[in-house]
């Protein structure tokens, strides 16, 4: 019954289109068939859930239709993409992994990825 370790990059810079991607990797202590991945945002000591998806190992992650997250899974690695980000969304994005089935349940929480978002400068009016 060892604790589950979750690794994620320390810092990611969002693209000019407000898209940030990072890998969340977990060291599974068991042979899980059902996994839940949640992205939490921590800013000013407030924690909010950004998105969550439950998937069966070997299948694709499916976030809700209105989610700002998309992702793919490969083994014990989840590639997460968050879109629609603006400067005000800069913060620490924490990857939470839960091995839901079969028993025993395991929880793993990463140290967080600091995502920096810089709003693009508006294009100056052209004289041409």
């Amino acid at each position: 019954c060892k604790a589950m370790h979750v690794a994620q990059p320390a810092v990611v810079l969002a693209s000019s289109r407000g898209i940030a991607s990072f890998v969340c990797e977990y060291a599974s202590p068991g042979k899980a068939t059902e996994v839940r991945v949640t992205v939490l945002r921590q800013a000013d000591s407030q924690v909010t859930e950004v998105c969550a998806a439950t998937y069966m190992m070997g299948n694709e992650l499916t976030f809700l239709d209105d989610s700002i997250c998309t992702g793919t899974s490969s083994g014990n690695q989840v590639n997460l993409t968050i879109q629609g980000l603006r400067a005000m969304d800069t913060g620490l994005y924490i990857c939470k992994v839960e091995l839901m089935y079969p028993p025993p349940y395991y929880l793993g929480i990463g140290n967080g990825t600091q995502i920096y978002v810089i709003d693009p400068e508006p294009c100056p009016d052209s004289d041409f």
């Epitope: 604790a3 370790h5 839940r36 949640t38 924690v47 439950t54 939470k96 089935y101 395991y106 929480i109």
Partner: antibody, heavy 118, light 107 residues
């Protein structure tokens, strides 16, 4: 505000059944796992069961496995504990508790008392 | 299952003193350890999660430390409202277990 309120406790004879309820308010119920934790008079805390998110995944303490059933109705923001084949050692104050974003139990109900006695 | 052993069973102190409570796990729980406070007739209240992070609204006189198997809850400058029973709990995997509790009483 964020709260959990238990109900359904009472005095019951050994071997009989009881159903506890836990009404949640102030948060998105379906986004959290909810546990039952009990406390016998003058004793410590004992985890009983948990049900996760959509309700498909459930875990039980060995002491209640096969006798207790945890369930939830996300449309009603309500958690249940069906307790069958009750024993004297099930006598306790039963709390429901929310598994917070980081896993610890961040919100607790005040509890409902179950007394199993002949 | 992981067994959590708390010591001492009872701690007799005066207001203003420092309380040091210990929790030892039978195997590593990493940092998936929480501390709760319970007063008579009340539900437990989360104080510390992740071994050292204070829960919302918890005064900074409460602090947690440790990882792996050995953990400490420290209460600096005990206030009258701090006299209660304290439980540690691990939550990194099932089954979830609690320590037997430490009672902090007025000397």
């Amino acid at each position: 505000q964020v709260q959990l309120v238990e109900s359904g406790g009472g005095v019951v004879q050994p071997g009989r059944s009881l159903r506890l309820s836990c009404a949640a308010s102030g948060f998105t119920f379906s986004s959290y796992g909810i546990h039952w934790v009990r406390q016998a008079p003058g004793k410590g805390l004992e985890w009983v069961a948990v049900i996760w998110y959509g309700g498909n995944n459930k875990y039980y303490a060995d002491s209640v496995k096969g006798r207790f059933t945890i369930s939830r109705d996300n449309s009603k923001n309500t958690l249940y504990l069906q307790m069958n084949s009750l024993r004297a050692e099930d006598t306790a104050l039963y709390h429901c508790a929310r598994s917070g974003n980081f896993g610890a139990f961040d919100i607790w109900g005040q509890g409902t008392m179950v007394t199993v006695s002949s | 299952e992981i067994v959590l052993t708390q010591s001492p069973g009872t701690l007799s102190l005066s207001p203003g003193e420092r309380a040091t409570l210990s929790c030892r796990a039978s195997q590593s729980v990493s940092s998936y350890l929480a501390w709760y406070q319970q007063k008579p007739g009340q539900a437990p209240r989360l104080l510390i999660y992740g071994a050292s992070s204070r829960a919302t609204g918890i005064p900074d006189r409460f602090s947690g430390s440790g990882s792996g198997t050995d953990f400490i809850l420290t209460i600096n400058r005990l206030e009258p409202e701090d006299f209660a029973v304290y439980y540690c709990q691990h939550y990194g995997n099932s089954p979830w277990t609690f320590g037997q509790g430490t009672k902090v009483e007025i000397k």
